[in-house]
Amino acid sequence: LQDPCSNCPAGTFCDNNRNQICSPCPPNSFSSAGGQRTCDICRQCKGVFRTRKECSSTSNAECDCTPGFHCLGAGCSMCEQDCKQGQELTKKGCKDCCFGTFNDQKRGICRPWTNCSLDGKSVLVNGTKERDVVCGPSPADLSPGASSVTPPAPAREPGHSPQ
């Protein structure tokens, strides 16, 4: 015998109090699949969370973070504070990158500068707290009579992964 509840589409629930007829989800709730016996309460984006997508009868609300914070966890379960470029977030707050490291993002930790010599190259532009070293040609290519080197045009550094 077919379960009468299986006919209830997303956005409704199978109401046991009303002879298992399909009732619309009440306000601030949703059901994303058919055949549900209850609707789920919509997520509320409060505090450092802000609403990215409103709740509907068939899908939950989606949150992201207010400016100055970034998402962590599946579905942006947590907001963590941003730091400035040239800093890293420690468990005691934002702190400047140590010499020899950099961070060109507002999140994450400081990364060691590239060691150009490991790839047989020379340093073209020194690193800073916010930017990696730029490696140039190998030292042999810089000998007298070698063709001049045009520094590479600035390009977008690796950025944030979409959450």
Epitope: E88, Q105, I109, T114, D132, E157, G159, S161
Partner: antibody, heavy 120, light 110 residues
Framework: QVQLVQSGAEVKKPGASVKVSCKAS????????MHWVRQAPGQGLEWMGW????????NYAQKFQGRVTITRDTSISTAYMELSRLRSDDTAVYYC?????????????WGQGTLVTVSS | SYVLTQPPSVSVAPGETARITCGGD??????VHWYQKKPDQAPVLVVY???YRPSGIPERISGSNSGNTATLTLSRVEAGDEADYYC????????????FGGGTQLIILG
Amino acid sequence: QVQLVQSGAEVKKPGASVKVSCKASGYNFSGYYMHWVRQAPGQGLEWMGWINPNSGGTNYAQKFQGRVTITRDTSISTAYMELSRLRSDDTAVYYCAREPGYYGSGLDYWGQGTLVTVSS
Amino acid sequence: SYVLTQPPSVSVAPGETARITCGGDDIGDKRVHWYQKKPDQAPVLVVYEDRYRPSGIPERISGSNSGNTATLTLSRVEAGDEADYYCQVWYSSPDHPGVFGGGTQLIILG
């Protein structure tokens, strides 16, 4: 969807070199650092190095410095890991893995692995 | 210190809770990531930055980190959880940026 597809298995003799490729698709290749990790038979995971595909900047684990070279070809969204002066204990599965956009987080996408066998 | 210490194996019955530890000097000050590795498969990130799950990872997998020990917890374990689990940390040192623990084999009894 993000995919990292690696080159096929290789058999090499001691002293030779091997070059493994990792072709990325489904995202902006230049925007995310690529890492290489290996696992020898019966051993654990071992980090080897990374490359910034945008600048070509690299960093290598001290153990591999002088033997490993990581490069990239942005025109075909491919990273390469070359290991030279191979020894029998370099027999391992080599993986490329993507960093999720900032240093200090976990590696979110991995290639399927490339088995390199070093045998005389 | 750049050594992360894991127990070689942890055994647990189906439905029970498994806890896998990762020890390191002041590891609580670092961000710890955990990977699941099954034979002939690529590693899968199951927890990142101590306690956050990527999309698609079940809520029964969780992580914590304080002092000298980080812990991966798998509650209501299933046969499909049998795998090796590795902790991993990034450092700002130029010589040892990426360090993995030795791995822990999770054995499901019965």
